[in-house]
Interface confidence: low
């Protein structure tokens, strides 16, 4: 029959070439002379000339060694024609299978593989996977079947078999307990891949296993005991820097310290924070310490990490003895701000009040007093007793110094400590009004017509407070009432000044006496300019000059 079974040819054949593989034969050769030919890739198309056929005998020839890794199978067509060129058979499939030889070594996909695993993990924990490839056939032969192995481990601590590798998958796992980053932070494994399932060619690579930090070391105070001296009253004062050592990875949560005051700070006077770079505990005062109340504090501080411990570890505790240093504290006025009511205008030398300070220090210090700020110079203060007396005229109506009836004075207390310290107090004198100002009209100059004159309305002001103000009364004196009339309008505290009789154009003095509810009288001279005009005027017109 015009059929050829698949032909198997090993790769890398040594020849001699051409090498006869199989004979094509048509049973039509009994009747006529047959000529044989082949077509297809490897024959008449690329790669051309690998195969040929003896034209008359039908022998299929191999002209050169084959490479399975390049072409694993050739599909050709065999043809048979008679002498006149007519086909005597249909084209026949010829399959040539290239069989594998172990002509390739395994190759790792990387020269160096990197993986990581937490310290302290249990045996069986997977670390990483390595991969090697082999171009040879791993389906029909073992030529391309790779087996993995660990050749060596560096360092060999705590022993030389810390890891294993799965021979067929390349998965590296922990095989022994005792991984400790603080002792060995990194292992270098020399790994091998061998084909023929471990019996063939070998290639080598490196697997670096980083041991990751777990919080298996507690921070430990070094030193554990501290003594510090802190001035009393200092807030935010750095008391002490506490130092810890931690074998875990620097700047990791397993290394970063968390400090806690666990004893000795009943009054919540202290606080502790972690310095981000040095990892020290910065102990500072949250409130001022009081030497007189307690001159020594013994604090207990515990340290842990930001990350929880992965196993039960002892907690380190530091003891800090804080000696409070006595500071000469300033005297404190009691109360800090004192309000005293006093009548304005009382005589010089009259007592206003006693204003004294207390000294927080234990020893009985002498305190002396003086006035620090007395804008008007109205007061004096006895340096020994703190007695405040009048030294000038207290004037409630003096707007330069008095605001809302209050005159503010700052006083000073100085102790005799070394160095001396000072405290200040505020004395607020509420000045009680007396009727020391009479009513005053505004304006004090008027212009008025001498014919059908408009009345002039003057506003009345009185610097005193009620009841030393309205209702007001008006009276014209010194014969001013002959020509003028004055009437008080109680509704709006004004006085209406009217011209009663004709006056020639000139300037006149109008003597107006105003008195308040307390009969405090004030005489004011109003300058009245009388003009030759009718009704309303603001300025006297120029006299008319005839032509």
């Amino acid at each position: 029959d015009w059929v050829v079974a698949p032909i198997s040819v090993p790769e890398n054949g040594k020849g001699p070439f051409p090498q006869r593989l199989n004979q094509l034969k048509s049973n039509k050769d009994r009747d006529t002379k047959i000529f044989y030919s082949i077509t297809g890739p490897g024959a008449d198309s690329p790669p051309e000339g690998v195969f040929a056929v003896e034209k008359e005998t039908g022998w299929l020839l191999l002209n050169k060694p084959l490479d399975r890794e390049e072409i694993a199978k050739y599909e050709l067509f065999g043809h048979a024609v008679s002498e006149n060129g007519a086909s005597v058979e249909d084209p026949m499939n010829i399959s040539i299978i290239v069989t594998d030889q172990n002509d390739h070594k395994p190759k790792f996909t990387q020269d160096t593989f990197r993986g990581s695993v937490l310290e302290g993990v249990l045996p069986g924990t997977s670390v990483m996977q390595v991969t090697a490839t082999d171009e040879d056939d791993a389906i029909h032969t073992y030529n391309g079947v790779v087996a993995y192995s660990i050749h060596s481990q560096e360092p060999k601590d705590p022993h030389d078999l810390m890891f294993t590798i799965h021979r067929s998958t390349g998965t590296i796992s922990v095989i022994s307990s005792g991984l400790d980053r603080e002792k060995v932070p990194e292992y270098t494994l020399t790994i091998q891949a061998t084909d023929m399932d471990g019996d063939g060619s070998t290639t080598t690579a490196v697997a670096v296993v980083e041991i990751l930090d777990a919080n298996d070391n507690a921070p430990v105070f070094d030193p554990q005991k501290y003594e510090s001296h802190v001035p009393e009253n200092a807030v935010g004062h750095e008391v002490q820097r506490l130092t810890v050592t931690d074998l875990d990875a620097p700047n990791s949560p397993a290394w970063r310290a968390t400090y806690l005051i666990v004893g000795g700070d009943d009054g919540d006077h202290f606080t502790i924070a972690t310095h981000p770079e040095s990892n020290q505990g910065i102990l500072t005062t949250r409130k001022g310490l009081d030497f007189e109340a307690k001159n020594q504090h013994t604090l207990y501080v515990e340290v842990t990490n930001e990350a929880p411990f992965v196993l039960k570890l002892p907690t380190s505790t530091a003891t800090i003895v804080v000696h409070v240093e006595d500071v000469n504290e300033a005297p404190v006025f009691v109360p800090p701000s004192k309000v005293v009511e006093v009548q304005e205008g009382i005589p010089t030398g009259e007592a206003v009040c006693v204003y004294t300070a207390k000294d927080p220090d234990k020893e009985n210090q002498k305190i002396s007093y003086r006035i620090l700020r007395d804008p008007a110079g109205w007061l004096a203060m006895d340096p020994d007793s703190g007695q405040v007396t009048v030294a000038g005229t207290l004037d409630r109506e003096d707007e330069r110094f008095v605001r809302n009836n209050i005159y503010e004075v700052m006083v000073l207390a100085v102790d005799n400590g070394s160095p001396p310290t000072t405290g200040t107090g505020t004395l607020l004198l509420t000045l009680i009004d007396v009727n020391d100002h009479g009513p005053v009209p505004e304006p004090r100059e008027i212009t008025i017509c001498n014919q059908s004159p408009e009345s002039q309305v003057l506003n009345i002001t009185d610097k005193d407070l009620s009841p030393h103000t309205s209702p007001f009364q008006a009276q014209l004196t010194d014969d001013s009432d002959i020509y003028w009339m004055a009437e008080v309008n109680e509704k709006d505290d004004t006085v209406v000044l009217s011209l009663k009789k004709f006056l020639k154009q000139d300037t006149y003095d109008v003597h107006l006496s105003l008195s308040d509810h307390g009969n405090k009288e004030q005489l004011t001279v109003i300058r009245a300019t009388v003009c030759d005009c009718h009704g309303h005027v603001e300025k006297c017109p120029d006299p008319w000059k005839g032509g």
């Epitope: 935010g236 949560p253 981000p276 770079e277 910065i282």
Partner: antibody, heavy 123, light 113 residues
Framework: EVQLLESGGGLVQPGGSLRLSCAAS????????INWVRQAPGKGLEWVGV???????NYASSVKGRFTISRDNSKNTVYLQMNSLRAEDTAVYYC?????????????????WGQGTLVTVSS | DIVMTQSPDSLAVSLGERATINCKSS????????????FAWYQQKPGQPPKLLIY???TRESGVPDRFSGSGSGTDFTLTISSLQAEDVAVYYC?????????FGQGTKLEIK
Amino acid sequence: EVQLLESGGGLVQPGGSLRLSCAASGFSFSSYPINWVRQAPGKGLEWVGVIWTGGGTNYASSVKGRFTISRDNSKNTVYLQMNSLRAEDTAVYYCAKSRGVYDFDGRGAMDYWGQGTLVTVSS
Amino acid sequence: DIVMTQSPDSLAVSLGERATINCKSSQSLLYSSNQKNYFAWYQQKPGQPPKLLIYWASTRESGVPDRFSGSGSGTDFTLTISSLQAEDVAVYYCQQYYSYPYTFGQGTKLEIK
């Protein structure tokens, strides 16, 4: 008003020494770290070092072992002692107050600076 | 040491326009325990000492006009001047205070176009 005033700059030969002073006023001097920062002519800023409230110090690697920072809280003054001076130490030297007393105040930032003093190292 | 790199080295912007300066650090300046970036911006005018503008990467120092703003976290930071004024002409420096030694960027010169 916060004020920092540097003094002590001048011309010095290579290998020589110089002591700069920084007088401070207007704030609670003893409570704040003080930095030294320098600026070579026409160049950028270079941090030299810092002195903490308790007297502890940190230095840039370029000056470590040659420069020493100290402070006298009673005089409100910080000093920069410069030994084994080199031509590359030529710069305007500024002292600068740390922004805060504590890390959480942004202590590493510098909120007040002096006007600077010029140090020239040349033969 | 942490290296601070500013870009651009110089910048010309029209009055009233937005100016942006960048600063990149060679390692993260974000401290995980307090989520703060240990980073500051300064302004230096000719013949004057530097002036602190921004700390904690985005907190404006008191007295600094609100046209100045800082942003960014980790390794990348930006100073923005929303509307450039004539008095903003200066050299701007970034600084890290995450670890010692403190380091500054090389500076960015800002001019008016």
